[in-house]
């Protein structure tokens, strides 16, 4: 006999990376007929909702009007049908950005390279942080962590045309509090297109993330959430 229901799906709209003082909605999707949903934050009950009518709703929304460092952290949700509870969802890492300072991103030997050249990104931030994150836009984009007192280096190794794209970096004050994003650096790689199959298998980041991030900051645009949950797990683990 089934003792628990399948776990719900959790994500943040418009994005799990939330600029300080902006609004975000945490969504939890379970099953039609669920009479109650619970949102947990850092292991404790944070909010409850009861969808009406339950037989026609399989998703609830928890609105956070003013993002700050106290609201950043790990969220999960569960739901109930009758007296039967679900398994908890995956963890959603909600990150507050635009904290304190803006890092500087540079690339060596330069933004225009030939396929096969070794490329290294440098992310520098003079305030008290030791962890840095490098993000690349695109459907098969990458997230890398780096460490250093005021600067981290991100060696990409010999690049292929698959490394082409726009990069930004953050300083991370803790896992869930990040700096402003750096200015973008566009890497242009010229060379043999056949080499693109050699692209490294790093954790993926959703397409147009930075387009979304910037639009979120300026206009509150909402974007399809299908990859968000997966992204959060890969990014912060």
């Amino acid at each position: 006999q089934q003792q628990t229901l399948p776990k719900p799906f959790i994500w943040a709209e418009p994005h799990f990376m939330v600029p300080k003082e902006k609004q975000v909605t945490i969504c939890c999707q379970g099953n039609y007929g669920a009479v109650e949903y619970q949102l947990h934050f850092e292991g404790s009950l944070f909010a409850v909702d009861r969808p009406k009518p339950p037989e026609r709703i399989n998703k609830v929304q928890f609105y956070i009007p003013d993002m700050n460092s106290r609201m950043a952290g790990q969220y999960s949700c569960i739901y109930r049908v009758g007296e039967l509870w679900s398994e908890p969802s995956n963890l959603l890492d909600l990150v507050v950005t635009e904290m304190y300072d803006t890092p500087t991103l540079s690339v060596h030997p330069g933004p225009e390279v030939i396929s096969g050249e070794k490329v290294t990104f440098y992310c520098r931030l003079d305030t008290a942080t030791s962890m840095f994150l490098l993000l690349k836009e695109g459907r098969s984009s990458h997230v890398q962590r780096g460490y250093g007192k005021v600067q981290a280096e991100f060696p990409l190794g010999p690049v292929t045309t698959a490394h082409r794209g726009t990069y930004r970096c953050f300083g991370s004050y803790n896992n869930h509090a990040w700096s402003f994003p750096s200015e973008p650096v566009k890497l242009l790689v010229t060379g043999d297109i056949e080499n693109t199959s050699l692209a490294p298998e790093d954790p993926t980041f959703p397409a147009d993330t930075w387009g979304t991030y910037l639009l979120t900051t300026e206009t509150g645009l909402q974007k399809d959430h299908a990859l968000w949950d997966h992204t959060a797990q890969n990014l912060l683990r």
Epitope: Q23, T25, V35, A47, V48, D49, R50, P51, K52, P53, P54, E55, R56, I57, V60, Q61, Y63, P65, D66
Partner: antibody, heavy 121, light 108 residues
Framework: QVQLQQPGAELVRPGTSVKLSCKAS????????MHWVKQRPGQGLEWIGV????????NYNQKFKGKATLTVDTSSSTAYMQLSSLTSEDSAVYYC??????????????WGQGTLVTVSA | QIVLTQSPAIMSASPGEKVTISCSAS?????MFWYQQKPGSSPKPWIY???NLASGVPARFSGSGSGTSYSLTISSMEAEDAATYYC???????????FGGGTKLEIK
């Protein structure tokens, strides 16, 4: 179609109580919130409280705690609001209103026609 | 407890005129709802979740806003639009409604 039937008027004495009814039809009674709203003549709308007919969970506006008590009878699909220790300040139209969740894509709110309660000696 | 402040409290408009009614929240809210009420009638849901028109509401009505500032707009006033309009905030759980003080719209 959805209907919320309320008596047209109630004349009551100061210091007494009155129990207002709201009979629902045309939908699954336990699947929606039932709210109660007060409107004094020529004035705005004041939310009194809400009940979940599925388990009688209630939430009240702090101002009406001790004044209003919300209950339901699921067998007759009827919601009730009892008002106690009536004074002239309680003279008003009282509406019941059914609602779905705020974010529900087909947000549905239906209001009864209201019951005019007159408190007079 | 969120407070909703509507402005103006009373206004009049000529047929064909554009009308805007504002609703300011004391702190940021996710959505705003609007009701229309005519004398002797119960309030009618008019706009839900900030910008969605309820069934039967003419397309000359629109709603917009975010955060603490919301508005209801009539692109071209008609006589039948004369009524009192209320903004409403809906806190999902514990469920709670908060109403603005109302704006009485009259036809010139």
């Amino acid at each position: 179609q959805v209907q919320l039937q309320q008596p047209g008027a109630e004349l009551v004495r100061p210091g007494t109580s009155v129990k207002l009814s709201c009979k629902a039809s045309g939908y699954t009674f336990t699947s929606y919130w039932m709210h109660w709203v007060k409107q004094r003549p020529g004035q705005g709308l004041e939310w009194i409280g809400v009940i979940d007919p599925s388990d009688s969970y209630t939430n009240y506006n702090q101002k009406f705690k001790g004044k209003a008590t919300l209950t339901v009878d699921t067998s007759s699909s009827t919601a009730y609001m009892q008002l106690s220790s009536l004074t002239s300040e309680d003279s008003a139209v009282y509406y019941c209103a059914r609602s779905s969740s705020a974010y529900y894509s087909n947000y549905e709110a239906y209001w009864g026609q209201g019951t005019l309660v007159t408190v007079s000696a | 407890q969120i407070v909703l402040t509507q402005s103006p409290a009373i206004m009049s408009a000529s047929p064909g005129e554009k009308v805007t009614i504002s609703c300011s929240a004391s702190s940021s809210v996710g959505y705003m709802f609007w009701y229309q009420q005519k004398p002797g009638s119960s309030p009618k849901p008019w706009i839900y979740r900030t910008s969605n028109l309820a069934s039967g509401v003419p397309a000359r009505f629109s709603g917009s806003g975010s955060g603490t500032s919301y508005s209801l707009t009539i692109s071209s006033m008609e006589a039948e639009d004369a009524a009192t309009y209320y903004c409403q905030q809906y806190h999902s759980y514990p469920p709670m409604w908060t109403f603005g003080g109302g704006t009485k719209l009259e036809i010139k």
